[in-house]
């Protein structure tokens, strides 16, 4: 779109996936587009088909290998190109020199579980998924708890400024249903962003003992 606005945003999950979104004002929904990935120092290249996710937005995942394989490093540069079909030919729409470890978004944490629950507190643990060993302990987390009668957006954020894959929630109300979510972010990368929120974990605090506050 010469006078419209387009946007090409990609993130590396730190292992073997680059997820991309291409949006363009005024583009037709049935436009056929692809993302081509050409690393500067690897023998492989990869392509994915952009599929519509909204009115003028398309997304795809460049699968670089098995989920836990380390396909890129901090010194790699991957040239990403958006190509769209115009009649019988392919037209280059956008190009980005992509630095994977400057554009990180990890997978959502998984395996959330209640380790221990009491009347006023609950200990929860989780695991990170497909995260590079390069980070060592240089990760941070945000967590939030959904209380009855509130929305996720109203839930205060709890920040864990270290690689700590558990939390002890306190000052909870007895015999009450809650939900819990967590997300992760590496400390590295100028354009790095938070992972998606984990699937919510539902739990219930224990009822207060009879005859006690």
């Amino acid at each position: 779109a010469v006078n419209g606005t387009s946007r090409f945003t990609c993130f590396y999950n730190s292992r073997a996936n680059i997820s991309c979104v291409w949006s363009q004002d005024g583009a037709l929904q049935d436009t056929s587009c692809q993302v081509h990935a050409w690393p500067d120092r690897r023998r492989w290249n990869q392509t994915c088909e952009l599929l519509p996710v909204s009115q003028a937005s398309w997304a795809c995942n460049l699968i670089l290998g098995t989920p836990d394989s380390q396909k890129l490093t901090a010194v790699d540069i991957v040239t990403l190109r958006v190509m769209c079909r115009e009649g019988v030919r392919w037209r280059m729409m956008a190009i980005q020199d992509f630095k994977p470890f400057e554009n990180l978004r990890l997978m959502a944490p998984i395996s959330l579980q209640v380790v221990h629950v009491e009347t006023h507190r609950c200990n929860i643990s989780w695991k990170i998924s497909q995260a590079s060993h390069y980070f060592e302990r240089h990760l941070e987390f945000e967590a939030r708890t959904l209380s009855p009668g509130h929305t996720w957006e109203e839930a205060p954020l709890m920040t864990l400024k270290q690689k700590q894959e558990w939390i002890c929630l306190e000052t909870l109300t007895p015999d009450t249903q809650y939900e819990f979510q967590v997300r992760v972010k590496p400390l590295q990368g100028e354009f790095t962003t938070w992972s998606p929120w984990s699937q919510p974990l539902a739990f219930r605090t224990k009822p207060a003992a009879l005859g006690k506050d």
Epitope: R7, T79, I95, D97
Partner: nanobody
């Protein structure tokens, strides 16, 4: 914040050549690839060419493909537009612009603009 300064414009005869320069400055300039645009009197600004700093990947407008070449010198943080086989219809004010990470043909995708340098092609 990215600053861009164009130079090299002038008066040239049809069929002649000219090289425009765009000097870029600012923090982490490699994150801001550069494009050239032009605006003729009474016309809308149009895309000419663009280049990324790291790989040197390029995009061109169909109207200049084969006549204009965009290049960059990373050591000097400068992008060049070599224009040859110039035509009177290439007469315009030529701007360089910088975009965050991605080059496209859309002027709205470029956040930083120079003041422009005038190119006049006489017949």
């Amino acid at each position: 914040e990215v600053q861009l300064v164009e130079s090299g414009g002038g008066l040239v005869q049809a069929g002649g050549s000219l090289r425009l320069s765009c000097a870029a400055s600012g923090r982490a300039i490699e994150n801001y690839p550069v494009g050239w645009f032009r605006q003729a009197p009474g016309k809308e600004r149009e895309f000419v060419a663009a280049i990324t700093w790291i790989s040197g990947s390029t995009l061109y407008a169909d109207s200049v493909k084969g006549r204009f070449t965009i290049s960059r010198d990373n050591a000097k943080n400068t992008v060049y537009l070599q224009m040859s086989s110039l035509k009177p219809e290439d007469t315009a004010l030529y701007y360089c612009a910088a975009a965050l990470k991605t080059i496209t043909r859309g002027q709205n995708d470029y956040s930083y603009w120079g003041q422009g340098t005038q190119v006049t092609v006489s017949s």
